[in-house]
Interface confidence: medium
């Protein structure tokens, strides 16, 4: 069966300066390929986090994505700013040259509240 990317929260609200967790789980690790988080959709979407060796300030993975059986690809965004508001998508790719997007979560909208 085709892999599903599940983002159970439709939205989260977070006060500026606080941190928030965006949940994402997969039903399978196959096909082999990376999982990435984006804000927005289409050509203008912004890469927020990739579960590889890259370093992303203020964004960390919640569980150990290097474990073979791990299906949790949730992320934590720290020190949230108003600029972080938007809809975040957890996206599964199939490895290739280039990688091919095969499934996206339904999106989680982040609302940033003034402190």
């Amino acid at each position: 069966t085709e892999v599903k990317v599940i983002q159970p929260e439709k939205s989260v609200s977070v006060a500026a300066g606080d941190s928030t967790v965006l949940n994402c789980t997969l039903t399978s690790l196959l096909p082999v390929g990376p999982i990435r988080w984006y804000r927005g959709v289409g050509q203008s979407r912004q890469l927020i986090y990739s579960f590889t060796t890259e370093h992303f300030p203020r964004v960390t993975n919640v569980s150990d994505a290097t474990k073979r059986s791990n299906l949790d690809f949730s992320i934590r965004i720290s020190n949230v700013t108003p600029e972080d508001a938007g809809t975040y998508y957890c996206v599964k790719f199939q490895r290739g040259s280039p990688d091919t997007e095969i499934q996206s979560g339904g999106g989680t909208e982040v609302y940033v509240l003034a402190k």
């Epitope: 599940i6 159970p8 929260e9």
Partner: antibody, heavy 119, light 108 residues
């Protein structure tokens, strides 16, 4: 107080059409995803369809896909379900249900409207 | 699609007794599970969400527990208004949203 009032139910023959309405009040209608859920006589609850607050995102249960169309008019605070090619197994009470703003469970329900499909 | 199985189908109890209703998911839904009450001629009512959080205005004799695939709704001391049909619903997976088949709590 949130109020959801369904209307448009009735008795129709197989193959015919019916349009259900749900008039909403007591909340900012356009900010909430809305659903139709049905209950056949003596049976459990069955989710039918979902529409996002803006109307851009729509889902259907496999059992109604291609026959039913969900829509909304945010200026009238009204949710609709256009039901075509009705079958005997569509006989049920149809409930309009308001989703929670963060998760896909249902905070508020209407009393329902009965649709009977019979020859 | 996540299938929810409720047991028992019918529970015959007397007022004042404790009711224990079960809901089993075919795959983990974590804590993304809600419980509803349906009385004849009334709109279904949200009782519990997040597996264990009572909805606004729900009396504390109703409690929910469990996570993953096994969930329980407990009514600590049944009152006359509590004799009804109860449904669980998962909202972890994207639509289709699924309900259990229901448990009827009837007067013994």
């Amino acid at each position: 107080d949130v109020q959801l009032v369904e209307s448009g139910g009735g008795v129709v023959r197989p193959g015919e059409s019916l349009r259900l309405s749900c008039a909403a009040s007591g909340f900012t209608f356009s900010s909430y995803d809305m659903n139709w859920v049905r209950q056949a006589p003596g049976e459990g609850l069955e989710w039918v369809s979902l529409i996002s607050g803006s109307g851009e995102i729509i889902y259907y249960a496999d059992s109604v896909k291609g026959r039913f169309t969900i829509s909304r008019d945010n200026s009238k605070n009204t949710l609709y379900l256009q039901m075509n090619s009705l079958r005997a197994e569509d006989t049920a009470v149809y409930y309009c249900a308001k989703e929670n703003n963060r998760y896909r469970f249902f905070d508020d329900w209407g009393l329902g409207t009965l649709v009977t499909v019979s020859s | 699609e996540t299938v929810l199985t409720q047991s028992p189908g019918t529970l015959s109890l007397s007022p004042g007794e404790r009711a224990t209703l079960n809901c089993r998911a075919s795959q983990s839904v974590y804590s993304y599970l809600a419980w509803y009450q349906e009385r004849p001629g009334q709109a279904p009512r949200l009782l519990i969400y997040g597996a264990s959080t009572r909805a606004t205005g729900i009396p504390d004799r109703f409690s929910g527990s469990g996570s993953g695939t096994e969930f329980t709704l407990t009514i600590s001391s049944l009152e006359s208004d509590d004799f009804a049909v109860y449904y669980c619903q998962q909202y972890y997976d994207r639509p289709p949203l699924t309900f259990g088949g229901g448990t009827k709590v009837e007067i013994k």
